[in-house]
Interface confidence: low
Amino acid sequence: TGADTEAVVCAGTACYTAHWGKLSAAEAQNLCLQNGGNLATVKSEEEAQHVQQVLAQLLRREAALTARMGKFWIGLQREKGKCLDPSLPLKGFSWVGGGEDTPYSNWHKELRNSCISKRCVSLLLDLSQPLLPGRLPKWSEGPCGSPGSPGSNIEGFVCKFSFKGMCRPLALGGPGQVTYTTPFQTTSSSLEAVPFASAANVACGEGDKDDSQSHYFLCKEKAPDVFDWGSSGPLCVSPKYGCNFNNGGCHQDCFEGGDGSFLCGCRPGFRLLDDLVTCASRNPCSSSPCRGGATCIPGPHGKNYTCRCPQGYQLDSSQLDCVDVDECQDSPCAQECVNTPGSFRCECWVGYEPGGPGEGACQDVDECALGRSPCAQGCTNTEGSFHCSCEEGYVLAGEDGTQCQDVDECVGPGGPLCDSLCFNTQGSFRCGCLPGWVLAPNGVSCAMGPVSLGPPSGPPDEEYKGEREGSTVPPAATASPTRGPEGTPKSTPTTRRPLLSSDAPITSVPLEVLAPSGSPGLWREPSIHHTTAASGAQEPAGGDSSVATQNDDGTDGQK
């Protein structure tokens, strides 16, 4: 690629490149990876400015500005299944190279919660306008695209390449051209900082003459955190120009000798480095006295210094080291505060979720809301929790108290509910009578009926129509309270007795209905069943005082 055909900005310890291309986020990340980088991070306002600069370069390379919005992928993504966290600046997104808790963000608009698909972030640019330094591109989140379908308005992407350090650009003391080739395969002749391991090709001369010389240099680490080209003195010097061409390539002062030669010098408070071109501050910070991420600020005239901490940190008692500020001491959150390095985040207690005005507010989760109730029957939402309830005839059950279990009224603690036979049903019960007896209108007592040799009356199955000796004999009428929603009985007898419908016949039924032949254990011998004198009936012979029960599931209900 020819020099300056690519958009590249280097600053601090990283370089940023911007590229056109209608690609998915994954394809863009792959291209950055191929050259040893990632999709760009924007972890601070300073970094946002570098990214804006490289995008401005890219836009300048396009012949005309177009009247449309364009999006450029950066390396901020949220995996499928990970939900939005409104309390964090990054809202639960994280940088592809690592890092979730960076404090800077610049969202285009409030994010909508969606956990079901991977989401990616792009920078939103108005391509009809030149980029203004004060208006940093906003972050827009959306689907990550797929090969051949990058997503709406995706125009390109920004890569970031990190380095141990940077060399200063080579300064020429006479006519010539410098071309830098970076480790990420970009060539440029106008870098403000040149990354470690870059090569510099210096072609001296006017360009149209054959007297041009070429020099090659490599940006190396000369000492820990000290990077330079290993060149000595200004390059491409010419007696014809002396100090007049580019200040002789000198960083600060240029001193001419009488013979057309010249030397570089430095102003008070600075010293000339080994390259005989660059000046460095003769400052008290050169020994790096500040620790723990603190920045050393030299005092005036090269005397004294102060250490400054990044936001969210403060100097310790030594005034040299940075320690994390515990923002949680200020109680900035409604419920739970988690201190993090340089910041904090708010969390909500179990039974609450983020919400309500302001930062760190929590609101009650309505566990009983439609479709999310954990209760089998009734559910009541409470502040921070909930509780379950059961309809009449059921009791709470299960380890967590969310299930409802049928109460067997036939063996209830209040003693027999029926005067003779008792049938437990789901949520209720029915009464029945021994042969020769019929159920009284109160649905509980038995009265002497027509002489019959049939079995006890009052079967579990109300739908049954049985035939015996040519006649249809419907089951005994038994009834139980009907129930409304949330466990509210529509009609509940005060004595918990089954209700009898007015048109129900009182009769006996075939034995086969109650106990099909060969079905063991359903009934004890009829002789043990009894009626009481409540209806003026007499107790049959062999009167045992127990009450027989049968559950609807066909098991013996007597416990």
Epitope: P89, Q311, E327, C333, G356, G360
Partner: antibody
Framework: DVNLVESGGGLVKLGGSLKLSCAAS????????MSWVRQSPEKRLEWVAT????????YYLDTVKGRFTISRDSAENTLYLQMSSLISEDTAVYYC?????????WGQGTLVTVSA | DIVLTQSPATLSVTPGDSVSLSCRAS??????LHWYQQRSHESPRLLIK???QSISDIPSRFSGSGSGTDFTLSINSIETEDFGMYFC?????????FGAGTKLELK
């Protein structure tokens, strides 16, 4: 220590404009929501506007919507309230507040007087 | 908008007395209610957050209670520095609103 210092108040004509500033120090400004709250001469407190920690969300009292703009400069640790089309009901002491659980910290206030 | 009604408007007490200030919301605000004190010629300061949660550096004689629509600020054994205005504020929904205040004055 948390410190909030308001400035920019003064006497302004009906329909005029004014920009209030609030210099914040002693805490990580970019971590917190910030608000403006005003107090009328009758001592009634009224919330005016809130801005989220990164500046991407703003909320306004209905009566100031479209006339007031809340903004922040995290590099300068400064909160702003640009007021225009001022009416007599806007006369009040304007407080800059840091929002956490309620209005956790308040400045000393700056008086805005709207005259006919 | 949620309206907060404070009562009484004025309360005359002597140091050593204990008092209860009431704040009633026009609709349920759960526990999203905060209390502020404003002494003469000073800015308001947060006393109680979320109806009953104490704030560091605020004397323990100040306490809050209530949930839903009815809230109370209690001051146990009033001291001279406690005289001034007391405001309640809700953060349940936008717009954030304040009560008109209760003035606590020396009898």
């Amino acid at each position: 220590d948390v410190n909030l210092v308001e400035s920019g108040g003064g006497l302004v004509k009906l329909g005029g404009s004014l920009k209030l500033s609030c210099a914040a120090s002693g805490f990580t400004f970019s971590n917190y929501y910030m608000s403006w709250v005003r107090q009328s001469p009758e001592k009634r407190l009224e919330w005016v506007a809130t801005i989220s920690n990164n500046g991407d969300s703003t909320y306004y009292l209905d009566t100031v919507k479209g006339r007031f703009t809340i903004s922040r400069d995290s590099a300068e640790n400064t909160l702003y309230l640009q007021m225009s089309s001022l009416i007599s009901e806007d006369t009040a002491v304007y407080y800059c507040t840091r929002v956490g659980t309620g209005f956790t910290y308040w400045g000393q206030g700056t008086l805005v007087t709207v005259s006919a | 908008d949620i309206v907060l009604t404070q009562s009484p408007a004025t309360l005359s007490v002597t140091p050593g007395d204990s008092v209860s200030l009431s704040c009633r919301a026009s609709q349920s605000i759960n526990n999203y209610l905060h209390w502020y004190q404003q002494r003469s010629h000073e800015s308001p300061r947060l006393l109680i957050k979320f109806a009953s949660q104490s704030i560091s550096d605020i004397p323990s004689r100040f306490s809050g209670s209530g949930s839903g629509t009815d809230f109370t600020l209690s001051i146990n054994s009033i001291e001279t520095e406690d005289f001034g205005m007391y405001f309640c504020q809700q953060s349940n929904s936008w717009p954030l609103t304040f009560g008109a205040g209760t003035k606590l004055e020396l009898k």
